[in-house]
Interface confidence: low
């Protein structure tokens, strides 16, 4: 009888990660008696993948009906392929020996290449908030893809960004790769609703790229503008002073009224109105009883926004311009800060 040959008909096999790889192998004879083993790699460091004789190979199934008496098909399926499974697989026939089986003949090998999808891109921004006109950096990371070729793009609100640097690691051959990119974005006052998008395109995604996003609302701080105005009220001896706090983000804001440098009232922004661009407006007012003051009053609206140093705006209230009313000892009343009650 002709000497046994081990035939591996496929020089290479390309499989997507998570799928099953079929590695084909047939023998031309049943003689000599002995098991087939599959190895990844050659030489002394080769890795046993399947042993027909014994062992536990939970990911491997045999292709042919294993109960056939004259089975010469030793093809296997390896389930749930990962990039770590890439390599050259050899089907090796052993002949039965004592005490150990003896390697008899090897197939030519089948190179298994694994196509692995990149993980969903994760975009992260700076740890601290920044104000408009500042440049901030965003990073995008995606891992576990193969082959190495990959395209990464950055967008801000649909507009492609050009100021970024990208690295794919490792540089040499590997079972899988990672991509890391850093983009620079200049903030504007209108960026509360803006998004930065990292888009990754890879052969495994069949033209449907993966996207990771970061909301600039988590990055931006828009400081408020303050305006203090005086409005007369019906009672001759009272003046309504308002502090308009405009175009701020985020909402965290504390306002303090000072009369001649002394704290009159402190309140926290609650009933705010939202602008179209995502920033907030708020108004606070102080009802000043002019008759309680002999001299002019310096009223200061002091705002601490999002833990930043306080900003303030002052207004000089001319007492001489108002008639005095005897017997009143109330300098100011807290009439609340809901602007719908003002007019």
């Amino acid at each position: 009888e002709e000497e046994l040959q081990v035939i591996q008909p496929d020089k290479s096999v390309l499989v997507a990660a998570g799928e099953t790889a079929t590695l084909r192998c047939t023998a031309t004879s049943l003689i000599p008696v002995g098991p087939i083993q599959w190895f990844r790699g050659a030489g002394p460091g080769r890795e046993l993948i399947y042993n027909q004789k014994e062992g536990h190979f939970p990911r491997v199934t045999t292709v042919s009906e294993s109960t056939k008496r004259k089975n010469m098909d030793f093809s296997i399926r390896i389930g749930n392929i990962t990039p770590a499974d890439a390599g050259t697989y050899y089907c090796v026939k052993f002949r039965k020996g004592s005490p150990d089986d003896v390697e008899f003949k090897s197939g030519a090998g089948t190179e298994l290449s694994v196509r692995a999808k990149p993980s969903a891109p994760v975009v992260s921004g700076p740890a601290a908030r920044a104000t408009p006109q500042h440049t901030v950096s965003f990073t995008c990371e995606s891992h576990g893809f193969s082959p190495r070729d990959i395209t990464l793009k950055w967008f801000k609100n649909g507009n492609e960004l050009s100021d970024f640097q990208t690295n794919v690691d490792p540089v040499g051959e590997s079972v899988s790769y990672s991509i890391h990119s850093t983009a620079k974005v200049v903030l504007t006052r209108e960026d509360v609703h803006s998004q930065v998008i990292c888009e990754v395109a890879h052969v495994t995604l069949q033209g449907d790229p993966l996207r990771g996003t970061a909301n600039l609302s988590e990055t931006i701080r828009v400081p408020p503008t303050l305006e203090v105005t005086q409005q007369p009220v019906r009672a001759e001896n009272q003046v309504n002073v308002t502090c308009q706090v405009r175009k701020f983000y985020p909402q965290r804001l504390q306002l303090t009224w000072l009369e001649n440098g002394n704290v009159s009232r402190t309140e926290t922004a609650s009933t705010v109105t939202e602008n179209k661009d995502g920033t907030y407006n708020w108004m606070s007012w102080l009802l000043v009883n002019v008759s309680a003051h002999r001299d002019d009053v310096k009223l200061t609206c002091q705002v601490e926004h999002d833990g930043q140093p306080a900003v303030s705006k002052s207004h000089d209230l001319k007492v001489s311009a108002h008639p005095k009313e005897q017997g009143s000892n109330t300098a100011a009343e807290n009439t609340g800060s809901n602007e719908r009650n003002i007019y």
């Epitope: 098991p35 004789k53 536990h56 190979f57 939970p58 045999t62 294993s66």
Partner: antibody, heavy 120, light 107 residues
Framework: QVQLVQSGAEVKKPGASVKVSCKAS????????ISWVRQAPGQGLEWMGW????????NYAQKLQGRVTMTTDTSTSTAYMELRSLRSDDTAVYYC?????????????WGRGTLVTVSS | DIQMTQSPSSVSASVGDRVTITCRAS??????LAWYQQKPGKAPKLLIY???NLQSGVPSRFSGSGSGTDFTLTISSLQPEDFATYYC?????????FGGGTKVEIK
Amino acid sequence: QVQLVQSGAEVKKPGASVKVSCKASGYTFHGYGISWVRQAPGQGLEWMGWISAYSGETNYAQKLQGRVTMTTDTSTSTAYMELRSLRSDDTAVYYCAREAGSSWYDFDLWGRGTLVTVSS
Amino acid sequence: DIQMTQSPSSVSASVGDRVTITCRASQGISSWLAWYQQKPGKAPKLLIYAASNLQSGVPSRFSGSGSGTDFTLTISSLQPEDFATYYCQQGASFPITFGGGTKVEIK
């Protein structure tokens, strides 16, 4: 026909030994491992141990270590399970089962079982 | 040892019902779980191997799912011949262990 044929029922006294056989046919006996599984009356399945039909390598359940011996005879495609120092709680149906090719420790082929009764 | 906990221990159902049996491993076993059906006086029969693969000749109304520690056997439409006891079994490592069984009875 692919099958595992087991020996007949046994009645034993406490302290005695029993040897149950399991003859394989219809497939290459040495290509698979054999496990032994027992089932006490009205109870669930309990794995006793495994033997490679090719190499004779064994792995036994801890609680039976020292009392059980599993062997194979490739010339007759037969697996054997011997249990010594029998106790009343060894009364059970004893099954031999072949590991499937799909995953080494799944059992796709079972014998019909051998009832071993231990009673004084 | 890896403990296998099956629930419920019994379930009453009618022909046509959808029946779900769960099995939990005390530690991760990847997909190396099998499901068996056993009828009184008979040997167990392999239904599902590697958690979700249907054994040859088993009706497609049987399906398995899960990986790691939590697994499910589903009978989509119970047939008269399906009234039996079902066992899960981990094949990840020695010692091999079985669940306590779930008896599917006629309501």
